[in-house]
């Protein structure tokens, strides 16, 4: 075991938060301020990410882990590790090259991000529109017109479609 250890790269003993310093006979030196090493055995440290401008610091950089950013109010994160911040819009709007624009008739957006999506076409499922859609909300589809006809023999009308995760009242 001792022989194996002596044959190992001495840098493998340097823990996270340090780098293996070739200028000092491969001793472990602490990462300079504003830098980090998240794994052991590194020959250099990495520059800390700086959360500037529209980015906000969610987690400070330490000698062993990079800073993490999120976005200032009015913006939301995009991309891996919040690599970009995109402007929020209101519900009923979408972000275009010219800024936030209202959803066109027949489309909706119930979030502050993303694009306007078409209302559900109830007739494709043989159903009727129970509640009309708006710029902020999708239509609510109800029972099919046949279920509502006077001669329908069904004793109990079908339960309206429930959103996932909602329990019946």
């Amino acid at each position: 075991f001792e022989r194996t250890r002596s044959l190992q790269d001495p840098c493998s003993n340097c823990p996270a938060g340090t780098f293996c310093d070739n200028n000092r006979n491969q001793i472990c030196s602490p990462c300079p301020p504003n830098s980090f090493s998240s794994a052991g055995g590194q020959r250099t440290c990495d520059i800390c990410r700086q959360c500037k401008g529209v980015f906000r610091t969610r987690k400070e950089c330490s000698s062993t882990s990079n800073a993490e950013c999120d976005c200032t109010p009015g913006f939301h994160c995009l991309g891996a590790g919040c690599s970009m911040c995109e402007q929020d819009c209101k519900q009923g709007q979408e972000l275009t090259k010219k800024g936030c624009k209202d959803c066109c008739f027949g489309t909706f957006n119930d979030q502050k991000r993303g694009i306007c999506r078409p209302w559900t076409n109830c007739s494709l499922d043989g159903k009727s529109v129970l509640v009309n859609g708006t710029k902020e909300r999708d239509v609510v589809c109800g029972p099919s017109p046949a279920d509502l006809s006077p001669g329908a023999s069904s004793v109990t009308p079908p339960a309206p479609a429930r959103e996932p995760g909602h329990s019946p009242q």
């Epitope: 780098f19 310093d21 200028n23 030196s29 990462c31 300079p32 301020p33 504003n34 830098s35 020959r43 250099t44 440290c45 990495d46 520059i47």
Partner: nanobody
Framework: EVQLLESGGGLVQPGGSLRLSCAAS????????VGWVRQAPGKGLEWVSA????????YYAESVKGRFTISRDNAKNTLYLQMSSLRAEDTAVYYC???????????????RGQGTQVTVSS
């Protein structure tokens, strides 16, 4: 050739003050990220303070905040560390250090001087 020459160390009583100096040659101090590291007896190196982002920000280790002040005189190409309210645990060899940013994105530092011994004892 890059050189860093530290001076100003000595024996001081607890609660006392010292000012360390680091005269730099072979590079312009104001254009670099520079600072002070120390090595206490039987321990590894520890960052004490640094001037970063070409003077845009300063760094202090938690253990010295409010007691030590880093500064530089660009005309004299000299870095200083004003140390006050000194404690026994500040006893160490203090080195002037230059942060090096490598082309591949890595960061290391370089200490070229012999360091200056600071001993805090009654």
């Amino acid at each position: 050739e890059v050189q860093l020459l530290e001076s100003g160390g000595g024996l001081v009583q607890p609660g006392g003050s010292l000012r360390l100096s680091c005269a730099a040659s072979g590079f312009t101090l104001s254009a670099e990220d520079v600072g002070w590291v120390r090595q206490a007896p039987g321990k590894g190196l520890e960052w004490v303070s640094a001037i970063l982002d070409h003077g845009g920000s300063t760094y202090y280790a938690e253990s010295v905040k409010g007691r030590f002040t880093i500064s530089r005189d660009n005309a004299k190409n000299t870095l200083y560390l004003q140390m006050s309210s000194l404690r026994a645990e500040d006893t160490a060899v203090y080195y002037c250090a230059r942060v090096i940013y490598h082309a591949g994105g890595g960061v290391t530092f370089d200490t070229r001087g012999q360091g200056t011994q600071v001993t805090v004892s009654s």
